[in-house]
């Protein structure tokens, strides 16, 4: 089932079907018994019931108002009521470019990597019994595909790809031609594959301990393939023997990048640990990242304003 | 863009030495620290350990895994840092790359294979 029309502002081409489904329409054995009414108001305007005999071009099915077609005039706020429910759209109906296959305000924007897969399908679930046939066109210049029902692009991306690409169904509705368009801006990029290598959490961390006693600090990142993460840590006063950098942990994500973790173990905490930064960095050629801990006797929290302790 | 060169590695028995140099294409005269990264076979991805570090102040903080067995060191007239690597035990096995430390990564080199195995 389609779903509802969430968003409450909509915008939309003069000329094409269009229509709103309210949200409450799972409800389906109240909206049996249950009265339901549909408003518009517009300008001067409050609060108007709408109904087929409003006009010729407006259709009321359960949960849906249909416009045959949508035009300038029916720019306006419309409303759905059921015993305590209402739901509200701000509809702005825009006019078409008459000297294009599509309006420019319209239109979806998509950035595809070269050599990345690369897809479009024309596809719309609501109005499929209805349509008769769809177009696919690049630049307003049909394309020739093999399925004149679901017209379909899948291919690896190449730069010549860049483009508008426009659905466009035609349909019949009381024996009136129709016709809906999506036009896809699709630029092609160059592979953005490495992103900026990230560490997560607080950039700057005081943590709470007792001397004598040990500490793991924990260094967290996003990162790609090639990048590392490390500890940074008595550069000027020699190595401490208490303290250990444990192995890092690396767990790919889905999207292909790295989520690593590098633990900092400080044993036998003394009072050389104290006050003192230790700095997990990501790097990559990219640039760094770096986060900061600072060990803090408990005794002393007081000193330092609550948000900027981790436990 | 700089280049780095690794060399020296190889196949050497358990408690054996090897001596590894890296040199760069540009100074590093200016690099405050540079460090060896090694890649071991079964790591995740690329994943790289920081096992030894020096700053432009000679100053040396190594992985608990290698201290006391390997000495960083650099020579920034020559554009070069070394790794001097005793006592290898068969966990050091692993390609060993140089590059900065403490700020952005130059561009990886090829790495030089260390393998130890009796």
């Known amino acids: 089932a389609e779903s509802c029309t969430s968003r409450p502002h909509i915008t939309v081409v003069e000329g094409e079907p269009f229509y709103l489904k309210h949200c409450s329409c799972s409800l389906a054995h109240e909206i049996e018994t249950t009265t339901k009414s549909w408003y518009k108001s517009s300008g001067s305007q409050e609060h108007v019931e709408l109904n087929p005999r409003s006009s010729s071009r407006i259709a009321l099915h359960d949960c849906v108002l249909e416009f045959w077609p949508v035009e300038l005039n029916d720019t306006g706020s419309y409303f759905f009521q059921m015993k305590n429910y209402t739901q509200k759209w701000k509809l702005n109906v825009i006019r078409r470019n008459k000297h294009s296959c599509f309006t420019e305000r319209q239109v979806t924007s998509k950035i595809v990597e070269v050599k990345k897969f690369f897809q479009i399908t024309c596809e719309n679930s609501y109005y499929q019994t209805l349509v008769n046939s769809t177009s696919l066109y690049k630049n307003c210049k049909k394309l020739l595909l093999e399925n004149n029902k679901n017209p379909t692009i899948k291919k690896n991306a190449e730069f010549e790809d860049q483009g508008y690409y426009s659905c466009v169904h035609f349909l019949h509705h009381n024996g009136k031609l129709f016709n809906i368009t999506k036009t896809f801006n699709i630029t092609i990029v160059e592979d953005r594959s490495n992103i900026v290598p990230v560490l997560l959490g607080p950039k700057l961390n005081h943590v709470a301990v007792e001397l004598g006693k040990n500490v793991r600090l924990n260094c967290s990142a996003l990162l790609n393939e090639e990048d590392v993460i490390y500890w940074m840590f008595g550069e000027e006063n020699g190595s401490d023997p208490n303290i250990h950098e444990e192995k890092e942990m690396r767990i790919m994500t889905p999207e292909g990048k790295w989520h690593a973790s590098k633990v900092l173990r400080i044993e036998n905490i003394g009072e050389s640990n104290l006050n003192v930064l230790y700095n997990c960095t990501v790097a990559s050629t990219g640039g760094t990242d770096t986060k900061s801990f600072i060990l803090v006797r408990k005794a002393d929290m007081a000193d330092i304003p609550g948000h900027v302790f981790t436990r | 863009e700089v280049q780095l060169v690794e060399s020296g590695g190889g196949l050497v028995q358990p408690g054996g030495s090897l001596r590894l140099s890296c040199v760069a294409s540009?100074?590093?005269?200016?690099?405050?620290?540079m460090g060896w990264y090694r890649q071991a076979p079964q790591a995740p991805g690329k994943q790289r350990e920081l096992v030894a570090r020096i700053t432009s102040g000679g100053s040396t903080i190594y992985a608990t895994s290698v201290k006391g067995r390997f000495t960083i060191s650099r020579d920034n007239a020559k554009n070069t840092v070394y790794l001097q690597m005793d006592n290898l035990k068969p966990d050091d096995t692993a390609v060993y790359y140089c590059?900065?430390?403490?700020?952005?990564?130059?561009?990886w080199g090829q790495g030089t294979q260390v393998t130890v195995s009796s």
């Open positions: 590059n900065i430390y403490g700020g952005a990564l130059w561009p």
């Open positions: 540009g100074s590093i005269s200016s690099i405050n620290g």
